[in-house]
Amino acid sequence: HLYPGEVCPGMDIRNNLTRLHELENCSVIEGHLQILLMFKTRPEDFRDLSFPKLIMITDYLLLFRVYGLESLKDLFPNLTVIRGSRLFFNYALVIFEMVHLKELGLYNLMNITRGSVRIEKNNELCYLATIDWSRILDSVEDNYIVLNKDDNEECGDICPGTAKGKTNCPATVINGQFVERCWTHSHCQKVCPTICKSHGCTAEGLCCHSECLGNCSQPDDPTKCVACRNFYLDGRCVETCPPPYYHFQDWRCVNFSFCQDLHHKCKNSRRQGCHQYVIHNNKCIPECPSGYTMNSSNLLCTPCLGPCPKVCHLLEGEKTIDSVTSAQELRGCTVINGSLIINIRGGNNLAAELEANLGLIEEISGYLKIRRSYALVSLSFFRKLRLIRGETLEIGNYSFYALDNQNLRQLWDWSKHNLTITQGKLFFHYNPKLCLSEIHKMEEVSGTKGRQERNDIALKTNGDQASCENELLKFSYIRTSFDKILLRWEPYWPPDFRDLLGFMLFYKEAPYQNVTEFDGQDACGSNSWTVVDIDPPLRSNDPKSQNHPGWLMRGLKPWTQYAIFVKTLVTFSDERRTYGAKSDIIYVQTDATNPSVPLDPISVSNSSSQIILKWKPPSDPNGNITHYLVFWERQAEDSELFELDYCLKGLKLPSRTWSPPFESEDSQKHNQSEYEDSAGECCSCPKTDSQILKELEESSFRKTFEDYLHNVVFVPRKTSSGTGAEDPRPS
């Protein structure tokens, strides 16, 4: 009875319904379930789809933009528990922009163990006010349920029996009022006596055994649970896994061979990101915690004496780090038995991620090669690297090799970092931002001075774009339009004018005037500069009639402040001296233009002859908004409006004080036409500072969530299925 089907890995089902059938025999999803981005599905596609075996999801359930899905009552009729072991932005249940969903219908959902609920922007979604979430989860105050049809008092939510004048469903108190609780017009919400806590109860209200979670078929019996509060072992719910079993994924007990199989499957596979499971504190976990190292004979984590040595043997003697994911595979390594090739072209929060994953490496037995890592500004993420042995060398006998790193400005802070290179030479070519002084300092510190030959460190292609020595460039002319900025600056010529290769113009959006040239610790951060290469002007022999170099910046955002600076690009002179010049950072704002469209219009009728319309300001005001234009036209009536018997519910008309689900500061500021009564005597009170602050925080929180959602769900296409059963890692 307990979990009658299979344990399935986390799933991401998108674009079409094909992969939904993989859920067919699943009782437990060990991981998350995401169903999203299905734009061609219709209600009839879901008619015969049902997964009655699914009882529990260990992480979270996310539904996003699945067209045609009107209810979950047939899809997941027996889903009882969402554990929330890992959450989606603090949420265990997310229903977002489900355009056709009319009701949740998860009528057997009894417990969300951790995390809360976010139900937002579902235009057709009703039966929300009839759910008592406090019976399902603890942190009800963290729920975020807004911008659904339910908000507008347009829902005729009728619980079972109401139409016949009977009360069939449990009623619980919210805000001092008893309200009937149901999921749909035919399914009550199941409520248990408070003594039962989250263990669940039978239909008669007899509590399930306290090791149960959510529901059971008989009281007092840990073998008759629908799901387990703590751990599942051989058809029984138990408080803790007894020897010889180990806790796994926070919900089940597994034996040693299960954990060992996972360890070896990962070890023997070439799959990135799988975990070589180990045993620690009676748990089978993905890796030893910090301060512990694995005993390979029994997979047990044992405490390290001093800092944990973790020798990582590289397949084929070398490893290329080309992403955060590949860096994660070396997390915790202190000694690299082999050579590392760093080839990082992009990524988010790179410096922090690289330090978290590579920052414990103290020693590399082979060579270190930094090649075409356009994203790197510094190598300081190798925080503890003290020794490169050079036991194997790159072709040409190099133990440290830096080639074509367009943004590398610093190796390490040599005042705080020691590095010894036992064997091999240094190679530096085409590192345009890396000053020669930095390279010479490395020669001294690492003990490699005198080993290099003439062409190992290129004099002309290292630091050639760096402002190692500067004169000040001054802007002489600035003109703006809504999407362009025209700049000119004073001419600059080095002693040999042929050494001037051109100028580099750096710019970026800067809401505040606090930008520095080296903002962002990698070259891919959101605050990194856009760079334009500009040819030098024609040189005139008459100093008074010199052409002022300049540039027309195009495609800019209206009404936006930009930080701008310019610097020279010069070649090396024979004396190894770099001439160069650089301007201060200036701030220039583009002009205003037409705004983008207003957002989220919401209409409601407050009488038979009036429609109230509210909206949010446009995401891009492109200036100060002074007024809005409203257009309307009559449309054909929706027959569904006539079929619903509104009298059953006794719906109230919205009162004059009606306000839409959002009332942001902006919508107040930009939408001054308040709805006054006929006498015109009353106006709304000004908002308090705390109200305004709260609304700003709410608006910011909404944006943050949407950004997070989009970043997580929109991924480049790749041909792979969900996490394989052989890899039960956190999905």
């Epitope: 006596p193 003594i195 806590k197 008669e204 306290s210």
Partner: antibody, heavy 118, light 108 residues
Framework: EVQLVESGGGVVQPGGSLRLSCAAS????????MHWVRQAPGKGLEWVSL????????YYADSVKGRFTISRDNSKNSLYLQMNSLRAEDTALYYC???????????WGQGTLVTVSS | EIVLTQSPGTLSLSPGERATLSCRAS???????LAWYQQKPGQAPRLLIY???SRATGVPDRFSGSGYGTDFSLTISRLELEDFAVYYC?????????FGQGTRLEIK
Amino acid sequence: EVQLVESGGGVVQPGGSLRLSCAASGFTFDDYAMHWVRQAPGKGLEWVSLISWDGGSTYYADSVKGRFTISRDNSKNSLYLQMNSLRAEDTALYYCAKARGVVIIDYWGQGTLVTVSS
Amino acid sequence: EIVLTQSPGTLSLSPGERATLSCRASQSLSSSFLAWYQQKPGQAPRLLIYGAGSRATGVPDRFSGSGYGTDFSLTISRLELEDFAVYYCQQYDRSQITFGQGTRLEIK
């Protein structure tokens, strides 16, 4: 056959203490919650306290909260009620009872009489 | 706490008659979380009904229960001699369990 045998009742002065015991047999004691219910002479039933199967959760009637403590020893199949600061109105026949589904009572002992009198 | 009021206090009927006992809660119970017990003189109580309408094991089918919210009833369709006793209702909706004061069913 389920058997519940209460002991420890007697006469005690107001403000005094008493400890009731209940010996259980005929069922797996540590699978079930247990109750104490009392009945004043010639009066109705009054629920006193409840303890979960493992002793992790306890509940009390407002009338005894802070004065009475329910406990259990699963290794001895025994249920206890420690009664302090006794009052005249605590005089009653005290029943030890086995719960079904925690909240209802399917088996009762025969009761032990507690008399609080000066 | 929820107070349960039983009525009538005493009900006098003859064997073979139908008995209806009432139990009213001071606050609405969130569901049918109510039980009925029978107690004969000098004996411990006996469970009859739970969940407002489910009979306990071994209880004859002449006993039935119903109700929802605040109003509940116990019906004995044809009284037999052994049915004359005191009947108590008990609510278990809240963590403060309470009993009604009882209804005495006596032979007329």
